[in-house]
Structures are given as C-alpha cells and as structure tokens.
C-alpha cells in the first residue's frame, strides 16, 4: 500500500492550525471498517491519533488533533493539529493498514516571527569620535533561533566584537540579544538584522550617531 506525504516540511506559525497531509489509494469496494490508521511521533513512537474498526479513536496528543472523517473514504488520512506549539515540531508518521500496510513520515516545522529590534546604546551621552560604545540589539519571541547580522551605514558587515545570545522562554520561543562593541567614527549608522531562517523574515533595527543628539530610527 502506497502512502504519500509531502516531501517538504509543513511550516506552521505558533498558535495557528496545521494540516499534516497523508493520503492512500483505496481499492474499489473499500470501506472504512477495513481501515486502520495511526499517526504517531516518528522518534518516540508516541501515539498521536488513530482510527480503527470504522471509528475515530480520538486524539492521544493533548486533544489538539483531528482527522477529516468525510474524506477518509477517499483516501485522505490527513491530520489537523490545532494551536501549534514549539513542542509540536518534529516528524510525524502516518501508518495506514487495510489489507496491505504502508507508512510515511511528514515533518512539521514550527516558526514564529521576531519582533522589530530595539536598540540601546551605552554610554548614551557625551559621545566623541574614538569612544568605544556598546550597541545592543534585542528582538523577541521568535522561533527558531535567529541569525543576527550587523553592518555600518555603508552596508559593510561588522563581524568583530559581536556577542549574540539566545534566551528561551517557557513556550520555547527565543529572545535574541546581540551586542556590538565599536569605536565611533565622526558619525555613523549601525544596523542590526535579525533573520528567522525558516520564514526568511528579516527584522531591522538601526541607530545613527551624529554627535548630539542620537537618533533611533
């Protein structure tokens, strides 16, 4: 029995619903009484949802899963996962047994966009060319962990003296803090870009130092 799932991961935003597609080709005369369907976590073998003896056996996974009962007879064994959490991320296996048996695994990729970075400067007054300043770029509640890039006003990457740290909250989302230590020129703009690698979403923040006062666009 051939079981088909998408090759690419299913990407779902935290808090939204996701459909993990799985399909099989029922033979003529197929009835749901013949169908055994099991969804489980690929790595831990934990049961997620099942269908047997013509009945939906329900969710074994935090009561957030559902099948598409009206579509099962047509070979649609897809699973609906509600209110996606970071902890849901991973591989799910769809097992289908009629007379024959088949299985396939589909990957769920969870994502959450990062907030627009906030920029802070230390020290933040009486700055002169040649002073060393610490610029902190902070962006919040994203997933997965971000890449952070710094550049100057001319678009030249700044890679030295950068320290980036991630902080996980209780929901598994990340706050990212990146610190750039730089010696000031006569004036300049310093930008940080926080990139979510799954969403290919870039969040930008910048600070312009023009003697006095400073501006935070």
């Amino acid at each position: 029995l051939e079981v088909q799932v998408p090759e690419d991961p299913v990407v779902a935003l935290v808090g939204t619903d996701a459909t993990l597609c799985c399909s099989f080709s029922p033979e003529p005369g197929f009835s749901l009484a013949q169908l055994n369907l099991i969804w489980q976590l690929t790595d831990t073998k934990q049961l997620v949802h099942s269908f047997a003896e013509g009945q939906d056996q329900g969710s074994a996974y935090a009561n957030r899963t559902a099948l598409f009962p009206d579509l099962l007879a047509q070979g649609n064994a897809s699973l609906r996962l509600q209110r996606v959490r970071v902890a849901d991320e991973g591989s799910f296996t769809c097992f289908v047994s009629i007379r024959d048996f088949g299985s396939a695994a589909v990957s769920l990729q969870v994502a959450a966009p990062y907030s627009k970075p906030s920029m802070t400067l230390e020290p933040n007054k009486d700055l002169r060319p040649g002073d060393t300043v610490t610029i902190t770029c902070s962006s919040y509640r994203g997933y997965p962990e971000a890449e952070v890039f710094w550049q100057d006003g001319q678009g030249v990457p700044l890679t030295g003296n950068v320290t980036t740290s991630q902080m996980a909250n209780e929901q598994g989302l990340f706050d990212v803090h990146s610190v750039l230590r730089v010696v000031l020129g006569a004036n300049g703009t310093y930008s940080c870009l926080v990139r979510n690698p799954v969403l290919q979403q870039d969040a930008h923040g910048s600070v312009t130092i023009t003697g006095q006062p400073m501006t935070f666009p």
Partner: antibody, heavy 121, light 108 residues
C-alpha cells in the same frame, strides 16, 4: 535505539589539527540540534559548540574555542563534525557528541561514549 | 554567563538512604535546568529536564524540584549503581550552555 558514536580522537602536538566525527542513528538526525561537550581528565563537563537543526547551520561556540574550532553537520550522512585547529594542551579532553532534547530546550538527552583527544608535545 | 554552583562537592551516604543535591544559579533560569548522572568511565546520562521532568527510563527514586535560582535533585533510596557524579546544566540563556561543577555521591 538512539546511538551516537564518536571517532577521530588521538594524540597530536600543540598547534596541530584534528577532525572529530559523530555518527548518529535511531532518530531523525536533521530534526535536532547537536552539540559537542568535553571533559578534561578528572574535571567537570564543558559545553564546546552547538549547531542548530535542518540545514540552517547556525553555530555557537564556547569562548575558549572560538576562532579555532568549527562545528558542522552532514544530514545526508547523519554525521556531526568538529574541526579543531591550533590545538592547545588545555584542549586535552574526552569529547562527547550530544543530542539536544529539542530545538528550544538545549538539554542533552543522548550522549556518545566519547573520543579522547590528547594534545602534548 | 550563568554560573551554576553545586553543593556539596562530595556527599557520603549509605545505600538505602536519601541523598539531596543542590544547584544554585547566578541568575534566574526559570525551570530550564537539567540533571545528569556520570558513573566512572561512562558518558553522562540525562536524569531530569525542565527542573522536574524525569527522562525516559529513569527510575522514580530520582526527582527534581525548584525554579528560578535554587534547584534540588533528590535520590529517595540510594542503590549501589547510584554512586556517581551528578551535574546540573542550564539552558535558559546561551551561549554558553553551562554546567555546575558536579557533586560526587560516594558510599559512606
């Protein structure tokens, strides 16, 4: 069953290089962040480096190895690597490959048996 | 960097007795703390994650508690195979991922 098997350790002189490998099986390798943790003789555990999952190749290093060590992974071969350059005597340790429990929670739920790296003149 | 301090450095206990190990963080790690056991000549093994959740296959004589900065690993009745070194590790704020210095549990 999850298995992590390190290889590539040995005796080298200060300044030389070594490449460690970790062959993974029993789980969907590409779905998990992976780490190297080391333990100097008679000492405690020290996290060395982490690479995140899929092919995003976002990497992190302990300050003690930054600029000298490079972590990488080949998801098609289910293998994690640690390229160690400019080795120092203080890098002498057993190096463990460790799987992150999840991608947001970086505890280490499975460890290899370790491979010994000795840096000595 | 979050520093983890474990105490005591060595704990002498008789088999069958209770052992209580402490781990203190230099700043709050919420519940992002794990405990590991390392027997001589072996790799570490995960016991507890998220401060109080037992890892797969870990006997229920091992329990973890605490949140914020103060954490405890309790072994209710020490078995011969429990004599080992125990490490705590935080994963709230990284890099670096940091470990405590370890507590050796030895036979009294």
């Amino acid at each position: 069953d999850v298995q992590l098997v390190e290889s590539g350790g040995g005796v080298v002189r200060p300044g030389e290089s070594l490449r460690l490998s970790c062959a993974a099986s029993g789980f969907t390798f590409s779905n998990y962040a992976m780490n190297w943790v080391r333990q100097a003789p008679g000492e405690g555990l020290e996290w060395v480096s982490r690479i995140n999952y899929k092919g995003y190749n976002i990497t992190y290093y302990a300050d003690s190895v930054k600029g000298r060590f490079t972590i990488s992974r080949d998801n098609s071969k289910n293998t994690l690597y640690l390229q160690m350059n400019s080795l120092r005597a203080e890098d002498t340790a057993v190096y463990y490959c460790a799987k992150s429990g999840s991608n947001s929670n970086n505890f280490f739920d499975y460890w290899g048996l370790g491979t010994l790296v000795t840096v000595s003149s | 960097e979050i520093v983890l301090t474990q105490s005591p450095g060595t704990l002498s206990v008789s088999p069958g007795e209770r052992a209580t190990l402490s781990c203190r963080a230099s700043q709050s790690v919420n519940s992002k703390l794990a405990w590991y056991q390392q027997r001589p000549g072996q790799a570490p093994r995960l016991l507890i994650y998220d401060a109080s959740s037992r890892a797969t296959g870990i006997p229920d004589r091992f329990s973890g508690s605490g949140s914020g900065t103060d954490f405890t690993l309790t072994i209710s009745r020490l078995e011969p195979e429990d004599f080992a070194v125990y490490y705590c590790q935080q994963y709230k704020n990284w890099p670096p991922l940091t470990f405590g210095g370890g507590t050796k549990v030895e036979i009294k």
